[in-house]
Interface confidence: low
């Protein structure tokens, strides 16, 4: 069962799945100036049996016609449903997360893929939140959100995470302060983007720290 909406947004935080549940779909998106090959897949699908999960289909991008090079590829109707995006991630994941039964690792990159990946999550998917660079957590350890089914409807649990500016102790989460945003966009528009390097460093650090152990009893 696909989750109806996106994981919740947290001011000055990003989310990331460490592994993807079977049934998760990843749109085959191409970078500007490229498009999916006509016979190519619309999406990759995490499938598997009791012992092994992997991504079905392979995304393929080809150069667009010259006249279309400045145009973004128009999504197909079945892709129009808006999903949260994360910047392209490295397939390297912590072993204990990626080898979960019934889960797929981060799919490897494909040639000329878009810089953002659009996932369609399924019930049971867990995503982890961390504060963006320049902000620190006021809660201990990573916070998580799980897509749950209740009364026939899907919902994401609320992650217990507050991020506050490191550089300025009076700075409170969400309070605006002048700072450079990627591509000059406002903070609020970029808060869901994860840069691979930052996230990997944070994840690796968290994995070695006692404070990375969190409880789910509170949800």
């Amino acid at each position: 069962e696909l989750c109806d909406d996106d994981p919740p947004e947290i001011p000055h935080a990003t989310f990331k799945a460490m592994a993807y549940k079977e049934g998760t779909m990843l749109n085959c998106e191409c970078k500007r100036g490229f498009r999916r090959i006509k016979s190519g897949s619309l999406y990759m699908l995490c499938t598997g049996n009791s012992s092994h999960s992997s991504w079905d289909n392979q995304c393929q991008c080809t150069s667009s016609a010259t006249r279309n090079t400045t145009k973004q590829v128009t999504p197909q109707p079945e892709e129009q449903k808006e999903r949260k995006t994360t910047e392209m991630q490295s397939p390297m994941q912590p072993v204990d997360q990626a080898s979960l039964p019934g889960h797929c690792r981060e799919p490897p990159p494909w040639e000329n893929e878009a810089t953002e990946r659009i996932y369609h999550f399924v019930v049971g998917q867990m995503v982890y939140y961390q504060c963006v660079q320049g902000y620190r957590a006021l809660h201990r350890g990573p916070a998580e959100s799980v897509c749950k089914m209740t009364h026939g409807k899907t919902r994401w649990t609320q992650p217990q995470l507050i991020c506050t500016g490191e550089m300025e102790t009076s700075q409170f989460p969400g309070e605006e302060k002048p700072q450079a945003s990627p591509e000059g966009r406002p903070e609020s528009e970029t808060s869901c983007l994860v840069t691979t390097t930052d996230f990997q460093i944070q994840t690796e650090m968290a994995a070695t720290m006692e404070t990375s152990i969190f409880t789910t009893e509170y949800q």
Partner: antibody, heavy 116, light 107 residues
Framework: QVQLVESGGGVVQPGRSLRLSCAAS????????MAWVRQAPGKGLEWVAY????????YYADSVKGRFTISRDNSKNTLYLQMNSLRAEDTAVYYC?????????WGQGTLVTVSS | DIQMTQSPSSLSASVGDRVTITCRAS??????LNWYQQKPGKAPRRLIY???SLQSGVPSRFSGSGSGTDYTLTISSLQPEDFATYYC?????????FGQGTKLEIK
């Protein structure tokens, strides 16, 4: 079952002090930020103070800055609000809350009356 | 501080009615908005977080929507237990602020 129980409220004269406590149970207190929210009789809600899980970061509403101090003792699973130089306008029910900015769980509240 | 203004301040309705309460922020709150229900003598109870996510255990007749500065809480079919005061609250910027409340009364 998350439980937050406030205590320490009562009647106090203007200019005097009072300390509120909030005993927490049913969740890992030391992992969560906490806050105090107040509600004057017949009025709306106001966030008063906020403290990070480790007590390193505290934030206050302008109306209480310099007079109120929020603190916590993670070994006792207890949140505190030290209120000094109390004013009539501080009269309210004070709620202890957790769940960060979303006020996920609340105590039943304790009434503070500042009156001469 | 961000000011939150709710309308109407009070509202009379009947069981079964569809009710809408609106909340306007003095600046963009980026969908970082919660809705609470409060009954006399009780602590507030969170109904909706992040504009439209239903709190666990809250009936599906409650729903939230909006973006930017304008937000809405809708109760699709009023039940007797829904008569209470409702508050919106932003958490994009400290101090987090509440609306002044909307009192929902039985007609």
């Amino acid at each position: 079952q998350v439980q937050l129980v406030e205590s320490g409220g009562g009647v106090v004269q203007p200019g005097r002090s009072l300390r509120l406590s909030c005993a927490a149970s049913g969740f890992t207190f030391s992992s969560h930020a906490m806050a105090w929210v107040r509600q004057a009789p017949g009025k709306g809600l106001e966030w008063v103070a906020y403290i990070s899980y480790d007590g390193d970061n505290t934030y206050y509403a302008d109306s209480v800055k310099g007079r109120f101090t929020i603190s916590r003792d993670n070994s006792k699973n207890t949140l505190y609000l030290q209120m000094n130089s109390l004013r009539a306008e501080d009269t309210a029910v004070y709620y202890c809350t957790t769940g960060g900015n979303s006020g996920y769980d609340w105590g039943q509240g304790t009434l503070v009356t500042v009156s001469s | 501080d961000i000011q939150m203004t709710q309308s109407p301040s009070s509202l009379s309705a009947s069981v079964g009615d569809r009710v809408t309460i609106t909340c306007r922020a003095s600046q963009n709150v980026n969908k970082f908005l919660n809705w609470y229900q409060q009954k006399p003598g009780k602590a507030p109870r969170r109904l909706i977080y992040g504009t439209n996510s239903l709190q666990s255990g809250v009936p599906s007749r409650f729903s939230g929507s909006g973006s930017g500065t304008d937000y809405t809480l809708t109760i699709s079919s009023l039940q007797p237990e829904d008569f209470a005061t409702y508050y919106c609250q932003q958490y994009t910027s400290w101090p987090w602020t509440f609306g002044q409340g909307t009192k929902l009364e039985i007609k």
